[in-house]
Structures are given as C-alpha cells and as structure tokens.
C-alpha cells in the first residue's frame, strides 16, 4: 500500500544509520518528475536542511544543505541510475565523513557532511513519486 | 474532497474556453513546491504540449511549449500572486491570440498561441499541490 506524499517522519541519525526508500516516479522522464529527500534539523518543514537530495528524473541530481535559512554550495551529478517508469530503491547511509546514496544497490552519489548528522530530527520524502517503503535502520550499539 | 494528483482529464479547447483549477501548495514556499499545468495534444503524457505552465511557488513562473518532442523558447515571469500556505484559484482562458492566466481573479500571465488551442486533447495538473477543483467551461455555441 502507498504511503502519503509528502511523507514526514521523525528520525535520529548517526554514523551507521541508513534511510531506505522505495518508490516510483509519477510521470515519464520526458516530463521531468522530481524526487526530493530532505534531512531536517527540526520537525518543521521550514527548518534547516542537513542534506538535501533532489532528483530530476532523466536529467540530474542536486545535493545541498540549507544553513541558517540559506542554501549553500550545490553539488550536481549527471549520473542517472534511475529507470524510466521503474520502481527504485534508494538507500542513504551515514558514513563517518559523508552520506552515501545507493540506487538499486549501486553506489551512485556521495555528499560530504557539512552539518553533523546528529543534528537531523526529521526526514521528508516528497515531490513526484509514489512511495511504498520508508525505513530508518539504526546501528546496534 | 481532494482530486488525485497527477490529475488528467480529456479536454477540447477553443477560443472562449476556460480551465479552472483550485488547489493549495503542499509545502511552504521556502521549500519551493511546484505546480504544473500541461495542455497536451494526445491523451498520452509523452505527447506534445501546447501550453506548459509551471509555477515554482515563491520564485517564478515558466511557460513553454513542447513541439515534436522538443522544448521551445521558455517565457519566464517573476510575478508571484500566489500566497504562501494559501489556497489559490487559477483560471486559464483561451483568447483569440493567447492564453490568459488569472490567479485569484487577477490577470497575472499571458502566453501567445504557438499551436492552435484546438489541438489540445488532454489537460494534466500535477506536482506539489493538493487539488480540490478542476473544471473546463466551454463557450456556448
């Protein structure tokens, strides 16, 4: 069954945590649907964003952070492992120095930590996708 | 009650027709939600687009056409009559020489016809909005 989109969930992250998302683009790639995943510092959507991950399907991925309300230096990738019309599985792992983004089991993007991952309080998944799975796995202490 | 998004409806347009849309952005303007309205030449979403109207809430509006699968010259406007968090009523009227876009009763954008409006067979409303009303009014013959 489908999860509501935008989908918002409280989360605490640290090295070893992984966020897993399963979904499908709502439109063909010609129409440039988007997927966005934001790691927020508060439960409010206006809060700062520790890690912003935005896919324009078929075109590009941009990653960034929003600090004290201002967007910082954008990182762009043309790598496009997503398939037109196909379900995707996205996993974002918190490594000691960066986020590692896997798409369908394949390491596809990395983003160096700008803000401590421990600052994350909420994850939001939204834009032009249907969502079937959202999970945060925590490292066993 | 809410209409499904993306929302797709068969439509035939000509001078005097008006498409009316009522909805609300799904996120605060800081997060740049989008609204998109596309007038397609076929019932298929990959078909050409006679009039493409995309709002990046709080930032800008772009209008364009997609002809033989290729995007043409984009028209951009910084006019932003939409209100953060507020419901909007959008009406797109087919005038003899252009589309006139009204937002909350106020004339806000125009787009000169590049393709005959009679070529439109389907309207799609999508991206980051909830949709409460969609109506196509036809000129009484």
């Amino acid at each position: 069954s489908l999860l509501p989109v935008p989908y918002t969930e409280a989360a605490s992250l640290s090295t070893g945590s992984t966020v897993t998302i399963k979904g499908r683009p709502l439109a063909c790639f010609l129409n440039e649907p988007y997927l966005q995943v934001d790691f927020h510092t508060e439960m409010k959507e206006e809060s700062d964003i520790v890690f912003h991950f935005q896919v324009c399907f078929g075109r590009r991925v941009v990653m960034n952070s929003r600090e004290y309300g201002a967007w910082k230096q954008q990182v762009e990738s043309k790598n496009m492992p997503f398939q037109d019309g196909q379900e995707f599985e996205l996993s974002i792992s918190v490594l000691p120095d960066k986020y590692q983004v896997m798409v369908n089991g394949q390491s596809s993007y990395t983003f160096d930590h700008r803000i401590k991952p421990e600052a994350v309080k909420m994850v939001q998944v939204w834009r032009d996708i249907s969502l079937t799975k959202f999970n945060v796995s925590y490292l066993k202490r | 009650s809410l209409l499904p998004v993306p929302y797709t409806e068969a439509a035939s347009l000509s001078t005097g027709s008006t498409v009316t849309i009522k909805g609300r952005p799904l996120a605060c303007f800081l997060n740049e939600p989008y609204l998109q309205v596309d007038f397609h030449t076929e019932m298929k979403e990959e078909s050409d687009i006679v009039f493409h109207f995309q709002v990046c809430f709080g930032r800008r509006v772009v209008m364009n056409s997609r002809e033989y699968g290729a995007w043409k010259q984009q028209v951009e406007s910084k006019n932003m009559p939409f209100q953060d968090g507020q419901e909007f009523e959008l009406s797109i009227s087919v005038l003899p020489d252009k589309y006139q876009v009204m937002v909350n009763g106020q004339s806000s954008y125009t787009f000169d016809h590049r393709i005959k409006p009679e070529a439109v067979k389907m309207v799609q409303v999508w991206r980051d909005i909830s949709l409460t009303k969609f109506n196509v009014s036809y000129l009484k013959r």
Epitope: T41, D48, S65, E67, Y68, K72, Q73, D97, K98, D112, H113, R114, I115, K116, E118, A119 | -
Partner: antibody
Amino acid sequence: QLQLVESGGGLVQPGGSLRLSCAASGFTFSSYWMYWVRQAPGKGLEWVSAINTGGGSTYYADSVKGRFTISRDNAKNTLYLQMNSLKPEDTALYYCARAGSGVAGTGYDYWGQGTQVTVSS
Amino acid sequence: QPVLNQPSAVSVSLGQTARITCQGGNFGYYYVSWYQQKPGQAPVLVIYRDSGRPSGIPERFSGSSSGDTATLTISGAQAEDEADYYCQSGSSSDNAVFGGGTHLTVL
C-alpha cells in the same frame, strides 16, 4: 613534501592594489578547496576567502566583499588573491591554507608561512 | 552567523591539565577545529571534527563539544605547548569563523 608558498605581499598606499599568489606542491591541488586567512599584527586569525576545487564557486568575508577576488589556476597549481581598494585595516599577514577535504570540520591541515601586506601612506 | 568567544588567556602548571573553551557556536550543528600557533609561525591544526587528532599531534591533545561550548583539553601540559590556540567552526565553505584566540601559559 607538501608545500604552500605565498608571495606578492608588500607596502601599498590606501586605495591601491596587490595580487597575492600561493604556489602549491606535493599534493593534487585541483582536488582541494583552498582558502586565504589573514592575521593583523598582534591580532587573531580572520577567514578571508574560499574557493572550491574547480574555481567556479568563491566566498568572501563581509569585510573584503567587492574588493578582493580569489581565483585559482589548477594547471599551474596556484591560488591567487587580487586585492583592490586596499584599506589600512587590510594590513596583515596573509596565509593560504588547504582544507583537509570538502568535509566540514576537517579544518585547514596545511598552511603557508604567509606574506605580509602593509597598507599605509 | 555565530561569534566564537574564547578566554584571552589560560595558565596551567607543567604536567597539569589545561582546558580552553570556545563558546557561542552551534556545536550541535557544526564541527569545531582547533589550531595551535607559536610566535612567528603559521597555525597548526591540532583537532578537527570536534575530537579528531591529525597524525603527528600528541595524544595529550583532545577535543569535545556540547551545545554551545567546545573544549580543547591538554592533559599533562608540556612547556612546548605554550602558544596561542584558536577554535574554528562553521560549514565547509563560506561561513568559517575563528574564535578570538587564547594564549596558554605553561608555568
């Protein structure tokens, strides 16, 4: 071994210009963000400017914005700081520094020995 | 943009523990780095990402942070540790901020 060597400092009148250079060796220069940090006589460290690996993104402290321009030539392994409309308060020892990586908090792991800029009439 | 405040001077007896604080930063948010600077020399990175120690830095140097305070601890201070120490925090690019500096005297 890894080295950063600044040059181009000197005495200049208020309103004048200088161009500082920082020659890098012993590491893959094009893979690192680079920075200018200054230290006025008897004072603390002040971050001045930053440039990303490709040189397409540049950042400045408010105190120098609009007057200073950071740039780099990755083919020559050299970092630059063009300083215009100099003021007496720009008088300082100017260091070039390398970031440990693009990761926040890795700090500036290598520094040059600095080049002195004196703005005085 | 945070302003980082450090005490202007700290004294410690030889072999004792020195603690230098850095206040006013959002250290739940941003990492802190620490630099040592001796007279006439360039700064040297002694702590990065709150508590990381670069190779070649003695184990007696350690760092921690909590809330709005970061602390550099020198356990068993040596005469050669007498220097100015600066904290630095902020993001990776355009908002790096240095504290005002603390002079450590080893008695």
